[in-house]
């Protein structure tokens, strides 16, 4: 299970991953 | 309040190079990505290429790549786009964006446009 | 690369009367896994940068008028400006954000 591109809810920006596009999100960031 | 500040408008020689800066204040530099997007004079937008400052990573429009590389310095919040090889046809506006990376990916800041002429 | 197309190219509008803009892309700019659409509109006014009006195809943008309204999901989106003002000149792009980057060809609306 790749869970590289998985963007947390409530956590630290320091996490997310550059993705090339809204395509390649799981979830939105709040 | 958010600003992207460019740098001024350069006079070019074909096949030589141009650096353009984007100075971004009144926001955490590193969580959101910066596009480089040109408009050729008469012309519509063309996203050229974004870099996401916390890792340096980037992305670029396939028309340029090997021709435009997309930097960032995060102490001081600036990012730069340097396109080689010039040629009359990269005459045009070039505009740095603020990318909502990781939400809407919609550029919701500009700068103010730079002039890059290029000619012999 | 995904493609977008905009039509009409020109616009001439009667002020106080509606307008409507169409974006087609070559794929499809819906994620189902967050049911969002990564489709933007922008206005770009005479001379100056361009400005986000509509993300994620619907939603307006922060101090945008609610005359503007963004629809559409999957390929097909549409933009309406309900009653056209004469600050609302100027050229409309769509640009895709699912996969890298893409504007369409841009939409110039002028006044009659």
């Known amino acids: 299970l790749d869970l590289s591109n998985v963007q947390s809810k409530c956590g630290s920006k320091d996490n997310i991953k550059h993705v090339p596009g809204g395509g390649s999100v799981q979830i939105v960031y709040k | 309040q958010v600003q992207l500040v460019q740098s001024g408008a350069e006079v070019k020689k074909p096949g030589s190079s141009v650096k353009v800066s984007c100075k971004a204040s009144g926001y955490t530099f590193s969580d959101y990505v910066i596009s480089w997007v040109r408009q050729a004079p008469g012309q519509g937008l063309e996203w050229m290429g974004e870099?996401?400052?916390?890792?340096?990573?980037?992305y670029y429009n396939e028309k340029f790549k090997g021709r435009v590389t997309i930097t960032a310095d995060k102490s001081t919040s600036t990012a730069y786009m340097e396109l080689s090889s010039l040629r009359s046809e990269d005459t045009a506006v070039y505009y740095c964006?603020?990318?909502?990376?990781?939400?809407?990916?919609?550029?919701?800041?500009w700068g103010q446009g730079t002039l890059v002429t290029v000619s012999s | 690369d995904i493609v977008m197309s905009q039509s009409p190219l020109s616009l001439p509008v009667t002020p106080g009367e509606p307008a409507s803009i169409s974006c087609k892309s070559s794929?499809?700019?819906?994620?189902?896994?967050?049911?969002?659409?990564?489709l933007a509109w922008y206005l770009q006014k005479p001379g100056q940068s361009p400005q986000l009006l509509i993300y994620?195809?619907?939603t307006r943008e922060s101090g945008v008028p609610d005359r503007f309204t963004g629809s559409g999901s999957g390929t097909d989106f549409t933009l309406k400006i309900s009653r056209v003002e004469a600050e609302d000149v100027g050229v409309y792009y769509c640009?895709?954000?699912?996969?890298?980057?893409?504007f369409g060809q841009g939409t110039k609306v002028e006044i009659k």
């Open positions: 964006a603020r990318d909502y990376y990781g939400t809407s990916f919609a550029m919701d800041y």
């Open positions: 870099i996401f400052p916390r890792s340096g990573s980037t």
């Open positions: 994620w195809a619907s």
């Open positions: 794929q499809s700019l819906l994620n189902s896994r967050t049911r969002k659409n990564y």
């Open positions: 640009k895709q954000s699912f996969y890298l980057r893409t």
